[in-house]
């Protein structure tokens, strides 16, 4: 038997994938566990796996369909379920109704590449990744930068108010080693959250031009 | 601004049929769902059917095997095909449509259509 609190929170990345973690307070021996989403109103149910990411906290991705398909949308309610094996049948153990409108994460913005590098400017670009064409342009980005010497909790947030995948950071320190990440959020749902920070995309400023003697 | 007109009610005698219609018009947008909703006096409004992206249609019981909604996307256009019509089934008809308009969704009514059914 399983004792103490648990929590079961579970994002719709808004195309093909929902993703779940399943937090137990209580020490589960080598039990299987699995998520199962069962919607109210398509001919499809689907199961996944949940796998450690740490002590106390599972983990799975609900794949729906090919990544770009638009398999909910606003009115769909899944009924998602935490099953675990106890013997030979299984237990619930978590149950929530989850409406994936109200509850969107999005990938992680992705190809992020320097399209220019200056001594003290670069512009620098990415995709956005499987997002629902509800959303047309508009999202909004975060982006930071690490500089030398500071930690990305240091790093101050630049706020992009519309889908504008580029940016030009400016005011940099020539000849210096940088990296730079961006996230994305639709407007969209009362417990939305950003996505996932991308992958951090490493330049180098151009070295200044040496001054002539005075 | 965005426009639902319905169209289609009237009076009918038991065992009839009767085909209702919604246009959506205005502004920008993209319709995730539209569907049919029923009041009856003294009632709250509930759905009798609805069709969201990717042909999910959802009925209530009593109307299954007796009506069926059709949505044409391309048209911003949702039908309602009602036969074997009952005297139960008269009410103000509403139409409904779930729009996203600038990345937030909202839902939108129409001013409904009278059926009359008369036994």
């Known amino acids: 038997a399983v004792n103490g609190t648990s929590q079961f929170t579970c994002f719709y990345n808004s195309r093909a994938n929902i993703s779940c973690v399943w937090s137990q307070d209580g020490a589960l021996q080598d039990t299987s566990c699995q998520v199962h989403a069962w919607p109210d109103r398509r001919r499809w149910n689907q199961t996944c796996e949940l796998l450690p990411v740490s002590q106390a906290s599972w983990a799975c991705n609900l794949i729906l369909g090919a990544p770009d398909s638009q398999k909910l949308t606003t009115v769909d309610i899944v009924t998602l379920r935490v099953l675990c094996r106890e013997g030979v049948r299984w237990r619930v153990m978590a149950i929530q109704d989850f409406k994936p409108f109200e509850n969107l994460r999005l990938m992680a913005p992705i190809s992020l590449q320097v399209v220019h590098v200056e001594t003290h400017r670069c512009n620098i670009s990415w995709e956005i990744s499987q997002a629902s064409h509800y959303f047309e342009r508009h999202l909004e980005f975060e982006a930071r930068t690490l500089s030398p010497g500071h930690t990305w909790e240091e790093a101050p947030l630049l706020t992009l108010k519309q889908k504008q995948e580029w940016i030009c950071l400016e005011t940099l320190t020539p000849d210096t080693q940088y990296e730079f990440q961006v996230r994305v959020k639709p407007l969209q749902g009362e417990f939305t959250t950003w996505s996932p920070w991308s992958q951090p995309l490493a330049f180098r400023t151009k070295p200044a031009a040496l001054g002539k003697d005075t | 601004q965005v426009q639902l007109v319905e169209s289609g009610g009237g009076l009918v005698q038991t065992g009839g049929s009767l085909r209702l219609s919604c246009a959506v018009s205005?502004?920008?947008?993209?319709?995730?769902?539209m569907g049919w909703y029923r009041q009856v006096p003294g009632k709250q409004r509930e759905l009798v059917a609805d069709?969201?992206?990717?042909?999910?249609?959802k009925y209530a019981d009593s109307v299954k095997g007796r009506f069926s909604i059709l949505r044409d996307s391309a048209k911003n256009t949702v039908y309602l095909q009602m036969s074997s019509l009952k005297p139960e089934d008269t009410g103000i008809y509403y139409c409904?449509?779930?729009?996203?308009?600038?990345?937030?969704?909202?839902?939108?009514w129409g001013q409904g259509t009278q059926v009359t059914v008369s036994s």
């Open positions: 069709m969201a992206d990717g042909g999910s249609a």
């Open positions: 409904k449509a779930g729009l996203w308009i600038a990345g937030r969704h909202s839902d939108y």
């Open positions: 205005g502004s920008r947008f993209i319709s995730d769902v």
